[in-house]
Interface confidence: medium
Amino acid sequence: YSHWPSCCPSKGQDTSEELLRWSTVPVPPLEPARPNRHPESCRASEDGPLNSRAISPWRYELDRDLNRLPQDLYHARCLCPHCVSLQTGSHMDPRGNSELLYHNQTVFYRRPCHGEKGTHKGYCLERRLYRVSLACVCVRPRVMG
Amino acid sequence: YSHWPSCCPSKGQDTSEELLRWSTVPVPPLEPARPNRHPESCRASEDGPLNSRAISPWRYELDRDLNRLPQDLYHARCLCPHCVSLQTGSHMDPRGNSELLYHNQTVFYRRPCHGEKGTHKGYCLERRLYRVSLACVCVRPRVMG
């Protein structure tokens, strides 16, 4: 099949390298975190970012790998097994489960690549799918048929 | 900041180009869809994928742009303004809001790039942040101080 022409280097700059540099800016979730007085507690706040106001609250865990692109990924970690009551914001409601929402993200790993005679010739990129948890969601438990 | 060494082309293949080809596999959310008898309704199912069992249910809308990498992105669209009652799975509970969780995703656009004298020299990649809605989350409304 045909595909786009190769990207053009600017003034001798290798564009793959440019791509690598561009992609290393961490992109955490959009809403800036505000101070959370109970950052690890199983409660739904009335202020702060979405992940602390959710009745399935979660925290973000940084996953950094300097041989991966992007280097910084964030995994959601649920703070409660069940959902928090909308009424109180603190007691758990066993009728709802707090479940992780997963996503298979495309990432690239750098690997040594070898020349024609097996010599080490810099680094190549290897594409992989990487499972990331995005958020915790309050769901009704599955009814087994 | 430091960055990786340049990627090595394999047998003359431009690695940026390789990156383009690798990156085009659509990667939708992980959990496969099961039948949803009310795909657009404001209710929390007891079976099916996470987005239909959530008490802040959502659907996915395809956003395709052939000049963007990835070409296919999916935006969550909330089906209810409030959260669905855990008790009934259908009635809304006005004490909770169904809010979109946003993420700034790194995407690349292909743009014509120009040589030293302004000549068109194939395509370059331009990095952008692109706002994607990942899911709908049931939250306690903000209390205005």
Epitope: - | L20, T24, P39, P49, N51, Y60, L69, Y74
Partner: antibody
Framework: EVQLVESGAEVKKPGASVKVSCKAS????????MNWVRQAPGQRLEWMGL????????SYNQNFKGRVTLTVDTSASTAYLELNSLRSEDTGVYYC???????????????WGQGTLVTVS | DIQMTQSPSSLSASVGDRVTITCSAS??????LNWYQQKPGKVPKLLIY???SLHSGVPSRFSGSGSGTDFTLTISSLQPEDVATYYC?????????FGQGTKLEIK
């Protein structure tokens, strides 16, 4: 062998709804989006929308003004088209068509169902 | 929506003739164009994708060319089994749109 088998012909009254099914076999159902295309008598092909069976993600042709709903049952490898508020001009053959893709270059409907004739009168 | 216009709407040619069908887009669509063949009473079949790539199993007498707004489907040597209606389709943007079709007959 890839096959798309659609449900049988339907006759409906104006204002009613119709639901057409498309059973896929011979490939990984969740790996390809499914398109729906309509052909009214003597008219050009008209794209109605598509659905990704993997996550239920959809894109609709807004010319149908929200009358179209696409769904899938992955356990049965079946896609469904529902069209409501039927009018006489909805009479035609409705096709499901698998969408193949390659890198940056193409999205193309490479396998088609045999078509379902819907008559509204 | 992107409008696709084919010409001619119908044509009659002899076996062995070189036949050309054109398709024009209302805006530039790069090479994001497919061609389909629909024989009388049959289902549409993919013929050419991405302007010029032949789908598997399609005879080499079919070819496609063009870019931007103007595209061409060519049959180098018309055969009796080529009697059909031919449709172009753009996929640059949703909604996908088709040309009105070109009906090809044998003289």
């Amino acid at each position: 062998e890839v096959q798309l088998v659609e449900s049988g012909a339907e006759v409906k009254k104006p204002g009613a709804s119709v639901k057409v099914s498309c059973k896929a076999s011979g490939y990984s159902f969740s790996g390809y989006t499914m398109n729906w295309v309509r052909q009214a008598p003597g008219q050009r092909l008209e794209w109605m929308g598509l659905i990704n069976p993997y996550n239920g993600g959809t894109s609709y042709n807004q010319n149908f003004k929200g009358r179209v709903t696409l769904t899938v049952d992955t356990s049965a490898s079946t896609a469904y088209l529902e069209l409501n508020s039927l009018r006489s001009e909805d009479t035609g053959v409705y096709y499901c068509a698998r969408e193949d893709f390659d890198s940056w270059t193409y999205f193309a409907m490479d396998y088609w169902g045999q078509g379902t004739l819907v008559t509204v009168s | 929506d992107i409008q696709m216009t084919q010409s001619p709407s119908s044509l009659s040619a002899s076996v062995g003739d070189r036949v050309t069908i054109t398709c024009s887009a209302s805006q530039g669509i790069s090479n994001y164009l497919n061609w389909y063949q629909q024989k009388p009473g049959k289902v549409p079949k993919l013929l050419i994708y991405y302007t010029s790539s032949l789908h598997s199993g399609v005879p080499s007498r079919f070819s496609g060319s063009g870019s931007g707004t103007d595209f061409t489907l060519t049959i180098s040597s018309l055969q009796p089994e080529d009697v059909a209606t031919y449709y172009c389709q753009q996929y640059l943007a949703f909604p996908y749109t088709f040309g009105q079709g070109t009906k090809l007959e044998i003289k």
